[in-house]
């Protein structure tokens, strides 16, 4: 057969559906690699050709679309299962062809299951809602183009094996689940099953997410910086080694860049000879505010180096601070012998 | 060590009430459900219901619907079972139990109370 | 309502030997089953979740098979501590439903 553009195996399209649900699969192809959509290719005379590679099979083989009650079809762009089993793990294949014309590109799919309590393999998607923030709501995800707007299905909310009915705080309401007033008690697995007819079966969709309650910008201030501070000096002697600790304090904000950065007489240290390092550590609270120390390590300072200046800095999207940090040398104890002496007279 | 320590026993006449107490020791920080079994004498084990007492949700076995009032007071981490229009069918070990999380599979019968004996008499 | 089934209601066996309990579901309950331990006054103690998985704790002589509506629970040498009601569970449905026990005794 004539060449055909390859775009490979798009691992970024790793798609999880659970067994014994339906599934619609689009074709990557016009999503992410072609410039022009299904029907442009459908009008212009291009046919779209689907297969698989069984799961630890090298072989390529044709799908079978003459299983009985149809249980795989597809539908323009769209290869549909209705429902899935756990053997339909695979890689699929969706080529786009003429005969002067082909493309190809091929995505694994992973029929996963679940239990009672909707554990599963399958990776969840992530959605924050702020802490006591008045009234967020979540939405059942990935549900559209499964039924027609005239069917109107039923939803059943759970928060891990259990349905959501009666909770203080969280109240179903088909496809969105409101939280008046989210707490950190709400942190957890939320679970919407989609239950619709078609052609006198019931089919049911099943698709969980974590919620994660973080810090409200109602609350959201610049970062803190707890030290350096004016409470600590950093007394050193040429020689030993200087520690300075920079802790900064960040409020949760939604996609802010959080930085901390040291200068030393204005410059990075990366821009200047001293033999400097720093260590960074990061830790979270339960909202996901976050704390960043970055310890700045100077091994064997030198009397030059406690003239300098040392400047913490910090920024967010709530703001930038700077802190100095108090570095001195430290005097010498006193000689006995000499400068003691000397204090009580002895000639 | 999580332990569940329930309420002494109690006598009671028919068509009142007995409230049933399940203190939880050594709770975790994520929210769970207290479930409720009791088991009449020589009988087996019948589920009753639940509370999750961080979050307020609870559920009852329809055979219960109207006459069962299950509760929690999270600040003292204790979980009561109300019983109401008591009948000598109602005599029976109730029995509360609860799992680590609301998440796992199996396990929601984790950790069980020693048991409270509840006799309708009249 | 899934009702569970089990047999036999009483089964006589000698300490040292094999026991084998059964569970049947009214309906498939996949591999959503639990199997509980009863000891005279006292409260019951999970063995066996997911059909087949040893609670903590839990001695490898008790092992749990099956799935969708069959269902076994075997005991591979009896113990003495062994002689007591086991009870089956399953939590695929609500409401959860428990068999009506299985009593071994020492014969």
């Known amino acids: 057969s004539e060449r055909c553009d390859d775009w490979g195996l798009d691992t970024m399209r790793q798609i999880q559906v659970f067994e014994d649900e339906p599934a619609r699969i689009k074709c990557p192809l016009f999503e992410h690699f072609l410039k022009f959509n299904y029907s442009t290719a459908h009008s212009a005379g291009l046919t779209l050709i689907w297969y698989w590679t069984r799961q630890d099979r090298d072989l390529e083989e044709p799908i079978n679309f003459r299983l009985p009650e149809n249980r795989i079809s597809k539908e323009k762009d769209v290869l549909w299962f209705r429902p899935t089993l756990l053997n339909d793990t695979g890689n699929y294949t969706c080529m786009l062809r003429n005969t002067t014309y082909c493309s190809k590109v091929a995505f694994p799919l992973e029929v996963v299951q679940k239990d009672s309590c909707f554990n599963s393999p399958m990776k969840l998607p992530v959605h924050k809602l702020y802490i006591e923030y008045g009234i967020q709501r979540i939405t059942c995800p990935n549900v559209d183009g499964y039924f027609p707007s005239s069917v109107k299905p039923t939803i059943t909310w759970y928060m891990g094996c259990y349905k959501i009915q009666n909770f203080n705080n969280v109240i179903p309401e088909g496809m969105n689940l409101s939280f008046l007033i989210a707490l950190i008690s709400n942190n957890g697995n939320y679970t919407c099953v989609v239950t619709y007819p078609e052609n006198g079966r019931t089919f049911h969709l099943t698709r969980t997410l974590t919620v994660k309650v973080v810090g409200s910008p109602k609350n959201a201030v610049p970062p803190v910086i707890h030290s350096p501070n004016d409470h600590v000096v950093y007394e050193k002697e040429p020689g030993e080694e200087l520690l300075i600790p920079c802790t900064v304090y960040f409020s949760f904000l939604m996609d802010s860049r959080n930085e901390v950065w040291w200068t030393i007489d204005g410059k990075k240290p990366d821009d200047i000879t001293i033999d400097v390092t720093i260590n960074e550590s990061i830790s979270h609270s339960r909202t996901e505010d976050e704390t960043r120390t970055q310890i700045l390590s100077i091994k064997k300072v030198t009397s030059e180096d406690l003239k300098r200046s040392y400047v913490c800095h910090a920024r967010s999207a709530k703001g930038e601070v700077a802190k100095a940090a108090k570095v001195k040398q430290k005097v010498p104890a006193p000689r006995y012998t000499v400068e003691l002496a000397c204090g009580f007279g002895a000639t | 060590q999580v332990q569940l320590v329930q309420s002494g026993a109690e006598v009671k006449k028919p068509g009142s009430s007995v409230k049933v107490s399940c203190k939880a020791s050594g709770s975790p920080a994520e929210p769970y459900a207290i479930q409720w079994v009791r088991q009449a004498p020589g009988q087996g084990l019948e589920w009753m219901g639940y509370i999750i007492p961080s979050l307020g949700g609870y559920d009852y076995a329809q055979k219960f619907q109207g006459r069962v009032t299950i509760t929690a007071d999270e600040s003292t981490s204790t979980a009561y079972m109300e019983l109401s229009s008591l009948r000598s069918e109602d005599t029976a070990v109730y029995y509360c139990a609860r799992g680590q999380t609301l998440y796992d599979s199996g396990r929601q019968f984790d950790i069980w109370g020693q048991g409270t004996l509840v006799t309708v008499s009249s | 309502e899934i009702v569970m089934t089990q047999s036999p209601a009483t089964l006589s066996v000698s300490p040292g030997e094999r026991a084998t309990l059964s569970c049947r579901a009214s309906?498939?309950?996949?591999?959503?089953l639990a199997w509980y331990q009863q000891k005279p006054g006292q409260a019951p103690r999970l063995l066996i979740y997911?059909?087949?998985t040893r609670a903590t704790g839990i001695p490898a002589r008790f092992s749990g098979s099956g799935s969708g509506t069959e269902f076994t629970l075997t005991i591979s040498s009896l113990q003495s501590e062994d002689f007591a009601v086991y009870y089956c569970q399953q939590y695929n449905n609500w409401p959860w439903t428990f068999g009506q026990g299985t009593k071994v005794e020492i014969k």
């Open positions: 309906q498939s309950v996949s591999s959503n």
């Open positions: 997911g059909a087949s």
